[in-house]
């Protein structure tokens, strides 16, 4: 007799994992035979959709390969013709081991700022998730907060935030761990000691103090007027991301002298300033010839024969010492090409150490003179015809301009490193060379003969003047 | 040969002065620099001022607004001249030449300060 | 103001032995390449004499036996081979910036 369907195990609830098989079972009575369709959140699942497997006439569907997706409600109807179809549903709930879909990243945050660290999660059930620092569970504070999403937030970083990070997610079925992050906190810039301003006397030395801070450590800078500073020099060491940066300085004029703290932030930078000034408090008597200051010569005609980076007295009688005084020697060095092939490297020497005399410290930044004895040198045994035709021109008044004057030192009032070798330069070019001997000629005095000390010959020039020299 | 001779030392009270001086000779005095070193009895040397070739002076922390160098070119003389002594001033004052080594000494003239 | 610190305070040594006396500035006496440290000897009842400046040129007049070494702050008088008439106080001093300042001082006796 024919049998309207009867479903005689209705659909339960069945529990899978993701890639793992789950199977619905639909037993029918009924005759005829009746045709059996199943249907996922009410849209028909197709008989030939290779993800499932439909037997015992449709009253077994098996999904060969739980998906998350897969979740929902699944029915089975019967109809045979006879009466009405019959349907039962049931759900499908995936059952998922916690997955990271979107694990935190490595962070570099600048500090005050909010930090978040993703970590976005799957699971079911919904996976509960914590965070590890270092080697210890992280516990929320009023800055730090775990989020809905997972992720964790960090209000107003601080240093002490930096670290090592990780998420765990949790759930019935297992737990995930998210791989190690870092978190990176940077500090801005920061003077924590700024240099302290100084009123000193001229050609004194001053040391200005400057220290900061900061993450990455900062760089120091010292600027001058301006500028870069061009002399004096730097101490820097740095301790528990304090940097300690000390500049000494030659004062010789005043400035104000800039600490400049620096440090990178990704492509942006920045920066702290602390200024401090160093004045030159008023001197009881005029400086007289000594007004001016000691730089390292920057000049080309006198570059081969001064030191290399010497530093020399610049006067500021001139408006612009530098280029007058480079103008002074480049104007003689011109008349120089014309004498003869002994005299011109002795000259050049005499002229070049003094016009641009070299600097000594001590009492303040004053010039050396030239020693007597290597001006004397110059004077009658290199340049000996030279000289006495310039001194002519010089009293028949055919020279009109000052600048010869100037460029040519009066020996006799030259001190004698005989008497203070640290009174006067000397002039290497012209120093005593064992090997080559070449003695002075005889010169009437009436004061005993002075020895040159034996000092370094100079590999520049094969000049040498004999170690026995008659002082004037 | 060079020769620094000091005179103007002795005895004097707390609170007194002297004058030292220092003939040069042997050189061209008005191009070099010129110092005072003392050494108290005992002790080791110290610096007190030098006086460079324009006669601008500079002084040791210790004596500086009590002592005061001078030169005199024409006589080669230096000078120094002590004020408001105190016995811790007593010591051999030397004369010397020289611009940052001390270069030439004199003997020296001793100084007592005591009551 | 720049402090030396001498060191040893006192030496004793035999004839032909070598000495070494130290010298350390507080700070650089290095300026326009030249060091600014400068020895003296004084004997027994005697002026002070200087020995060495530029922390290595040897004084006109000075024995080859006395030679001076160091750069920056750390400085050094060798006497190669000691003679009875070293015996002395040696002191060193910095011609940098003023004040001028000197070491305590090194005494060097005879064995």
């Known amino acids: 007799l024919p049998k309207a369907p009867v479903i005689t195990t209705p659909l339960e609830t069945v529990d899978a994992l993701v890639e793992e098989v789950a199977t619905f079972m639909c037993a029918v009575e009924s005759y005829p035979q009746p045709e059996i369709s199943w249907t996922r959140n009410k849209i028909l699942i197709k008989l030939f959709d290779t993800r499932y497997s439909i037997r015992e006439n449709g009253q077994l569907l098996t999904i060969l390969s739980v998906e998350d997706s897969d979740d929902g409600i699944y029915c089975c109807t019967a109809n045979n013709g006879v009466g009405g179809a019959v349907e039962s549903c049931g759900a499908l709930q995936v059952k998922m081991k916690p997955k990271i879909t979107r694990p935190p990243i490595n962070v570099k945050i600048i500090e005050g700022l909010k930090a978040v660290l993703p970590c976005t999660t799957m699971g079911n059930p919904k996976p509960s998730v914590s965070w590890i620092k270092g080697d210890s569970p992280l516990r929320e504070n009023s800055r730090t907060a775990v989020l809905e999403s997972g992720s964790l937030r960090i209000h107003n970083v601080q240093k002490e935030d930096a670290g090592q990070y990780r998420c765990v997610a949790k759930n019935s079925l297992g737990t995930a761990y998210s791989k190690v992050v870092k978190l990176e906190v940077e500090v801005f810039a920061r003077i924590l000691r700024a240099p302290e301003s100084h009123n000193v006397t001229f050609g004194s030395f001053v040391t200005l103090h400057c220290t900061a801070t900061g993450i990455p450590v900062p760089t120091i800078t010292w600027i001058e007027n301006g500028n870069a500073v061009s002399s004096g020099s730097i101490q820097e060491s740095v301790k528990d991301r304090v940097i300690d940066s000390r500049l000494q300085l030659f004062i010789t004029k005043p400035g104000l002298y800039t600490c400049i703290a620096t440090n990178k932030h990704g492509e942006k930078f920045s920066t702290a300033k602390a200024a401090a000034t160093v004045s030159i408090a008023e001197w009881s008597k005029p400086q007289k010839d000594n007004k001016g200051y000691c730089a390292q010569y920057r000049g080309e005609v006198c570059n081969a024969v001064l030191a290399k980076d010497a530093l020399v007295f610049l006067n500021t009688s001139y408006a612009d010492p530098e280029e007058a005084q480079e103008l002074l020697v480049h104007t003689a060095w011109n008349e120089l090409k014309v004498v003869s092939p002994l005299c011109r490297p002795a000259a050049e020497a005499l002229l070049c150490n003094h016009v641009f005399q070299e600097c000594s410290p001590g009492v303040v930044p004053t010039p050396i003179p030239i020693c007597r004895e290597y001006c004397l040198a110059v004077k009658e045994l290199f340049c000996a015809k030279e000289w006495l035709a310039m001194e002519e021109k010089t009293h028949r008044g055919l020279y009109r301009s000052e600048m010869h004057l100037l460029s040519v030192p009066e020996c006799s009032k030259l001190p004698s490193m005989h008497w203070d070798p640290t009174a006067c330069a000397r002039l290497p070019h012209l120093d005593y060379n064992k090997e080559n001997p070449k003695t002075f000629p005889p010169m009437t005095s009436s004061k005993p003969s002075v020895d040159i000390p034996n000092l370094p010959s100079s590999s520049s020039s094969s000049f040498s003047v004999s170690p026995t020299y008659s002082m004037t | 040969e060079v020769q620094l001779v000091e005179s103007g030392g002795g005895l004097v009270q707390p609170g007194g002065s002297l004058s030292l001086s220092c003939v040069a000779s042997?050189?061209?005095?008005?191009?070099?620099?010129m110092n005072w070193v003392r050494q108290a009895p005992g002790k080791g040397l110290e610096w007190l001022s030098v006086?460079?070739?324009?006669?601008?002076?500079y002084y040791a922390d210790s004596v500086k607004g009590r002592f005061t160098i001078s030169r005199d070119n024409v006589k080669n003389t230096l000078y120094l001249q002590l004020n408001n002594l105190k016995p811790e001033d007593t010591a051999l004052y030397y004369c010397v030449l020289g611009r940052t080594a001390l270069v030439r000494w004199g003997q020296g003239t001793q100084v007592t300060v005591s009551s | 103001e720049i402090v030396l610190t001498q060191s040893p305070s006192s030496v004793t040594a035999s004839a032909g032995e070598k000495v070494t006396i130290n010298c350390k500035s507080s700070q650089s006496v290095l300026y326009n390449q030249k060091n600014y440290l400068a020895w003296y000897q004084q004997r027994p009842g005697q002026s002070p004499r200087l020995l060495i400046y530029?922390?290595?040129t040897r004084e006109s007049g000075v024995p080859d036996r006395f030679s001076g070494s160091g750069s920056t702050t750390d400085f050094t008088l060798t006497i190669s081979s000691f003679q009875p008439e070293d015996v002395a106080v040696y002191y060193c001093q910095q011609g940098y910036s003023v004040p001028y300042t000197f070491g305590s001082g090194t005494r060097l006796e005879i064995k």
């Open positions: 006086i460079d070739t324009h006669s601008i002076a």
């Open positions: 042997g050189f061209t005095f008005s191009l070099y620099y």
């Open positions: 530029w922390a290595s």
